[in-house]
């Protein structure tokens, strides 16, 4: 969490951003909040990116002002206009790409004063893993697949019964480049699995951590998966 304060002249206002991550090929949100003002026409929001000459986005007098917008962001950005009055200056970014990563500044002017805060935006790819029993294998084998990751993640297997066990000797992980030549498909195979046990396939890079669980019994197979973004620090 980054909290910024205004400087000189008018009073300063508190602006708060949260470091976040964008999944390439999806819309992303850059979070920013500020002390609200009672009059929308008195609020100015400017989003800037380090190393970019033009503005990322500007909202003033109750509407978008995009005449100074950098070409890189043309047609891709929006604030939540109906939420600005309550102090939400978050930016929606369409079709996030690797090149969108960097340091952004959320700069706010209201009748109460000015303030700004920086935000570190990471970009990459992350997806839910799916764990299945590989019936084609000669022994009991589990196959963990996740379609899109970047940067290359680590894959670790764990089991409920053998907690703390190292499965690196009985697993094999491969990374296959996807057609757009950026993201990769992750496939990890775990051999010699035992029945009546819950196994977890954990995929992690510096942006996200995802886990796929599978419980195999004689009568049924239960699956569960979840994903969490890392480094959501506020400023």
């Amino acid at each position: 969490l980054i909290i910024g304060f205004g400087i000189s002249g008018r009073h300063s206002i508190t602006v708060t951003t949260v470091a976040s991550a964008g999944n390439i090929g999806e819309d992303g949100i850059l979070s920013c909040t500020f002390e609200p003002d009672i009059k929308l026409s008195d609020i100015v929001i400017q989003w800037l990116k380090e190393g970019v000459l033009g503005l990322v986005h500007e909202f003033k007098e109750g509407k978008d002002e995009l005449s100074e917008q950098d070409e890189m962001f043309r047609g891709r950005t929006a604030v939540f206009a109906d939420q600005v009055i309550v102090g939400n200056a978050s930016l929606r970014l369409k079709n996030v790409q690797l090149t969108d990563a960097g340091t952004y500044k959320c700069y706010i002017i209201t009748s109460k004063g000015k303030g700004n805060a920086n935000l570190e935006y990471k970009t990459g790819a992350f997806s839910m893993p799916e764990v299945n029993v590989d019936y084609n294998a000669s022994s009991e084998t589990l196959r963990c697949e996740a379609p899109r990751w970047f940067p290359q993640p680590t894959v670790v297997w764990a089991s409920q019964v053998d907690q703390g066990a190292n499965f690196s000797e009985v697993s094999n992980t491969s990374f296959e480049l996807n057609s757009e030549n950026v993201t990769m498909k992750v496939v990890s195979v775990l051999y010699n699995v035992t029945i009546n046990n819950t196994y977890s396939c954990m995929i992690e890079n510096d942006i996200a951590k995802a886990t796929g669980d599978i419980k195999v019994t004689e009568s049924e197979i239960k699956r569960r998966s979840h994903l969490q973004l890392l480094n959501s620090k506020a400023s």
Epitope: N23, I24, G25, E26, H57, K63, D64, L66, R74, G75, R76, T77, A78, V79, A81, D82, R92, K94, N95, A125, S127, P147, R148, N178, S179, E180
Partner: antibody, heavy 116, light 109 residues
Amino acid sequence: EVQLVESGGGLIQPGGSLRLSCAASGFIVSRNYMNWVRQAPGKGLEWVSVIYGSGRTDAADSVKGRFTISRDNSKNTLYLQMNSLRAEDTAVYYCARDADYGLDVWGQGTTVTVSS
Amino acid sequence: EIVLTQSPGTLSLSPGERATLSCRASQSVSSSYLAWYQQKPGQAPRLLIYGASSRATGIPDRFSGSGSGTDFTLTISRLEPEDFAVYYCQQYGSSPLYTFGQGTKLEIK
């Protein structure tokens, strides 16, 4: 040259299924938001479905649960699987690329007629 | 759901005249996510304007877009014979993800 070419349309009975294809050339389908948009005879444009660069999909309420958008990255082709077709699905179906700033490339359209 | 309402439904003008087409949204739309298209009979739509005011590649400068919030305008400064067609505004970003106006037919007077 950047181009989209649809195929697969035709006359189908209510309740039937059809799969539309859209072959792309000159750009990589998986790097863009790819859409299906339809136009009923004499009517306006209606958005049907999207597949994001990530592979996630979304669809209009009118087709959710019946139509499925997908892509084959190796063939650089977009698909629309249409099941449980109704008379009101009769339309020209266009595939269109969203290059971040609008639907800038459209196919020529393929006609789907649902009638008994 | 954001509804886009275009007016007039039909606009009858002569070549050389100025055309002003309106698109009104039921709630605020980001200027970045507002586009205009032209469609001629038997053809696919063609992107004219994106980001409310930026001309797409190859679009003549007689076409211009303006507006913000809930009111957007497409202006054709001097009508050419090939400009007579149906025009649609479109927004991105809400549910449904893409919404089109019902269209304005620009016909020769």
